[in-house]
């Protein structure tokens, strides 16, 4: 049965952050694991993909990842399927929105002493806690003339008077994070002496060393005062500027100009308007420095003609958000057509060969521009330049079979011989252009060869038959030195093959004819009874019409084959005594004797003081020890043949004589006594 060792469990997740649903399975055989979301199979994407058996989220999405996930393990052989417990995400998020007028229906209907209700359109999960601000100053619940309904995200002013005039903003925070209103609401209830906002400064993003302008205007009767402050509460005037704001200018209309902006100038600027009566109005705007990071590299892509493919360009991080566009051959791609840009994606529909080339993704903002190229290859089915031809190849020489094709990308060529894939080794080599080289053609290379040329778009194949033109050669070549046993019958074979069956004949090397007792029968030299005079040099000649003739020289030696006159016997010796293993052989040429003891040749030059091999071939071992026990082999050899004979040597302890045994008692073994 399939068992889940680890099951996915429901969990909290943060919008845009990583997450992992774990799944681990144990089963008797292999299984494959896939995931369901609300009962439908989950397809891998760059954002959400299988990681082993688990499901990995690079960035949780509250819309696409809401629902029930389930891990399914299937044994495809038996068909058995097991399903994990359901798991879902409690996704925490927060999203900014504007401050809007809820009541009355329009700004034109706002009059002194009427009720005004504003709504904060910031939403999130879990439900965030809201904070209201007038002209940047927090409004606490229960203060005079206003109430805050957190559940309905409303701020109610009842009744609204001139003192309530100002710029209303809201912020909300939750376990996920914090957001402030994307658009604020200016409430204006006339009290001529109160300062009223005419123009509020906006957040500005500028490139380094560029200029930034904040506009700020208030109206009142009499005219109000206006003052600019930077983050650390330092006032900015044309007479007294802070050291880091030397290039700041305050205009008569209240606008603040900053030239050649540097990183230290970034921050919050406050514009304060004060009327003859009423509270000061504080408006805030932030100066951000534009920035843009580098773009990640693209892998080269290979597509097939007729398919639809997409290449995603991930924009670099930057402020403001960089705009992204695709170009090809220096021309910006349209937003529709066959090859077009959709969002950040390059889309190639019904791909054609002409679509191949370099496509560039551009990203730009105030801080600059970044670009990254992607090389797109359109794979084509290979076409023939030269097919393999039926060929006649000469044995022993290199042979070549062509398989020349062209395609994009460069095709892969494989060769088959008798339907079996040829793997490159010392005999076969496939060149870069697809040609097969057979390094040294052999007779059995005569068969069918098939080459297959492939790209991702498809493959073509062709076959050819190879006929091997056999060279004129001895099969096998006669041994150059051969021995014949004196006074015995002997044969010396000689055979050859070629394109045509060759004629084979023997002759003596000196050109003299063969004696009558020596016959040449279809290449086999036959000696009815070998004599000493038969020794000498002979030549085997093989010839045919198209290939001429070849010769093989053989030196025949007449020998008396080896026989043993004396062979070593099974021998038992008392420890400390001397063992003698006799061996004598005869033959012509006179044989040499070698001994092998306990599986190693006894080298006469390295025997040491205890061992000695006599001229006649006998082996003597003095002061024998138990480790000398074993099989000893006498090997007799000459230039014509070799023979061996063996016998065991046993080394035993000398028995202690018992009282009952007289001095004449025989030993318990057949012994050599010395």
């Amino acid at each position: 049965a399939i068992v889940f060792i680890k099951q996915p469990s429901s969990q909290d997740a943060l919008q845009g952050r990583r997450a992992l649903l774990r799944c681990e399975v144990e089963a008797p055989g292999p299984v494959h694991v896939y995931w369901l979301l609300d009962g439908a199979p989950v397809q891998d994407t760059e954002r959400r993909f299988a990681q082993g058996s688990s499901l990995s989220f690079a960035a949780v999405d509250r819309l696409q990842d809401s629902g029930t996930f389930q891990c399914v393990a299937r044994d495809d052989v038996t068909g058995e399927e097991a399903r994990s417990a359901n798991a879902s995400f409690n996704i925490k998020w927060i999203e900014a929105g504007p401050v809007v007028l809820k009541h009355p229906a329009s700004e034109a209907e706002i009059q002194p002493q009427t009720q005004v209700t504003l709504r904060c359109h910031i939403d999130g999960h879990p439900r965030p806690t809201y904070q209201w601000f007038r002209d940047g100053t927090p409004l606490s619940d229960g203060q005079s003339n206003h109430t805050v309904s957190s559940k309905e995200r409303n701020l109610t002013l009842r009744p609204a008077g001139p003192e309530h005039s100002g710029l209303y903003s809201c912020c909300a925070h939750s376990a996920f994070g914090q957001a402030c209103s994307s658009q604020n609401f200016t409430l204006s209830i006339a009290d001529e002496s109160f300062a009223r906002v005419v123009l509020a400064p906006q957040d500005v993003v500028v490139a380094r060393y560029e200029e930034a302008m904040f506009h700020c205007q208030f109206s009142a009767q009499p005219p109000p005062s206006l003052q600019w402050l930077f983050e650390d509460e330092t006032p900015i005037t044309n007479r007294s500027r802070p050291p880091h704001l030397r290039r700041a200018t305050v205009f008569a209309n209240g606008s603040l100009l900053l030239t050649q902006v540097r990183p230290r100038n970034a921050g919050i600027y406050r514009c304060i308007g004060q009327g003859q009566r009423g509270p000061p109005i504080i408006l805030e705007a932030t100066l951000h420095l534009a920035e843009i990071e580098d773009m990640p590299l693209f892998e080269p892509r290979v597509f097939t003609a007729g398919s639809e493919e997409r290449v995603t360009c991930l924009p670099p991080k930057g402020l403001p958000e960089p705009s992204v566009w695709w170009e090809h051959a220096g021309v910006r791609l349209p937003t529709h057509g066959r090859v077009y840009q959709k969002g950040h994606e390059l889309v190639l529909a019904n791909i054609a060969e002409s679509d191949a080339g370099v496509y560039t993704c551009h990203a730009a903002n105030l801080a600059g521009q970044r670009r990254q190229d992607v090389n797109i290859t359109v794979a084509t089915v290979p076409s023939w330049l030269k097919k393999p031809q039926d060929s006649q190849l000469e044995e022993g020489k290199p042979g070549y079979l062509d398989c020349l094709t062209q395609a994009t990308p460069k095709p892969t060529v494989v060769w088959y011989r008798n339907q079996m894939l040829i793997s490159e080794d010392s005999r076969f080599e496939v060149f870069k252009n697809g040609t097969l080289r057979i390094n040294s053609v052999e007779v059995y290379d005569g068969t069918w060869y098939r080459c297959m040329s492939s790209t991702p778009a498809g493959s073509i194949e062709a076959q050819a038959r190879v006929q091997v033109l056999e060279k004129l050669k001895f099969t096998p070549p006669p041994q150059p030195q051969q021995c014949m046993e004196f006074d015995k019958e002997a044969t010396v074979p000689c055979s050859a093959t070629g394109r045509e069956k060759p004629t084979i004949k023997w002759e003596r090397a000196d050109g003299s004819s063969l004696p009558e007792w020596v016959t040449d029968n279809a290449g086999t030299l036959h000696f009815a009874r070998v004599t000493r005079d038969d020794a000498g040099n002979y030549t085997c000649i093989a010839s045919n019409g198209p290939q001429g003739q070849i010769r093989a020289h053989v030196q025949l030696t007449v020998a008396v084959f080896i026989t043993f006159k004396v062979e070593p016997e099974r021998t038992t010796v008392y420890q400390g005594h001397t063992a003698l293993l006799q061996c004598e052989a005869q033959g012509d040429p006179k044989p040499l004797i070698q001994w092998k003891g306990k599986d190693r040749i006894l080298d006469p030059t390295k025997l040491g003081p205890r061992m000695h091999i006599f001229q006649n071939g006998s082996l003597v071992i003095h002061d024998v020890a138990p480790e000398d026990s074993g099989r000893y082999t006498c090997i007799a050899g000459n230039s014509c043949n070799i023979k061996h004979t063996e016998a065991p040597l046993y080394v035993v302890d000398k028995p202690v004589p018992e009282e009952s045994e007289g001095p004449g008692s025989p030993p318990p073994y057949k012994m050599i006594q010395t």
Epitope: Y34, P41, Q43, D75, D76, T78, G79
Partner: antibody, heavy 112, light 110 residues
């Protein structure tokens, strides 16, 4: 003994409908996936569709709309409902549990 | 639409030969390994030989072996036996619970 037996095959006119049954014995359908595969005379195997252990169904693109797989776990039987039949639907229809266990097949002939 | 292409479509060989059948898919199979090979003889249901690319099914001789990954796979019979002359099919499984068969390779006596 674990086995599968198909039934319901026979002669049907073009445009007609037929329901094939695959009765399982020796195991419970609710823990297994079941496939339908067909083989036209002298031709290769062709996957029709699958019903998984929860009863969800998936089909080959050519089978969507005309063919429907269902099951009755109380009868331990899987069905293949075939509508708007054509001459090219003539084949032996096999049901299979996973890759290993196959039924003997049932012949469907669509002809006028 | 997924297309699985087997090559060759027909193959003649002799007892003792080494035989290789290839299977190419138009897209990668699930987990790069969800591929099976079947043997079918006339009038019989298919018999599973190899599952998950290279695992030998129960009772299948060790002369059968499978290899590959992604979208390209091979079935090898190391030394052809008289009982091996039949039709062979590859079957791939894909994301979304979709399966497909190759068109088959008929192995006949040379």
């Amino acid at each position: 003994e674990v086995q599968l037996v198909e039934s319901g095959g026979g002669l049907v006119q073009p445009g007609g409908s037929l329901r094939l049954s695959c009765t399982a014995s020796g195991f419970s359908l609710s823990n297994y996936v079941m496939n339908w595969v067909r083989q036209a005379p002298g031709k290769g195997l062709e996957w029709v569709g699958i019903i998984d252990s929860s009863g969800s169904t998936y089909y080959a693109s050519w089978a969507k709309g005309r063919f429907t797989i269902s099951r009755d776990t109380s009868k331990n039987t899987v069905y293949l409902q075939m509508n708007s039949l054509r001459a090219e639907d003539t084949a032996v229809y096999f049901c299979a549990r996973g890759l290993y266990l196959w039924g003997q097949g049932t012949l469907v002939t669509v002809s006028s | 639409e997924i297309v699985m292409t087997q090559s060759p479509s027909t193959l003649s060989a002799s007892v003792g030969d080494r035989v290789i059948i290839t299977c190419q898919s138009s897209q990668s199979v699930h987990n790069n390994n969800l591929l099976a090979w079947y043997q079918q003889k006339p009038g019989k249901a298919p018999k599973l030989l190899i599952y998950y690319t290279s695992n030998l099914a129960s009772g299948v001789p060790s002369r059968f072996s499978g290899s590959g990954s992604g979208a390209e796979f091979t079935l090898t019979i190391s030394s052809l036996q008289p009982d091996d002359f039949a039709t062979y099919y590859c079957q791939g499984g894909y994301n979304g619970n979709i399966y497909a068969f190759g068109q088959g390779t008929k192995l006949t006596v040379l």
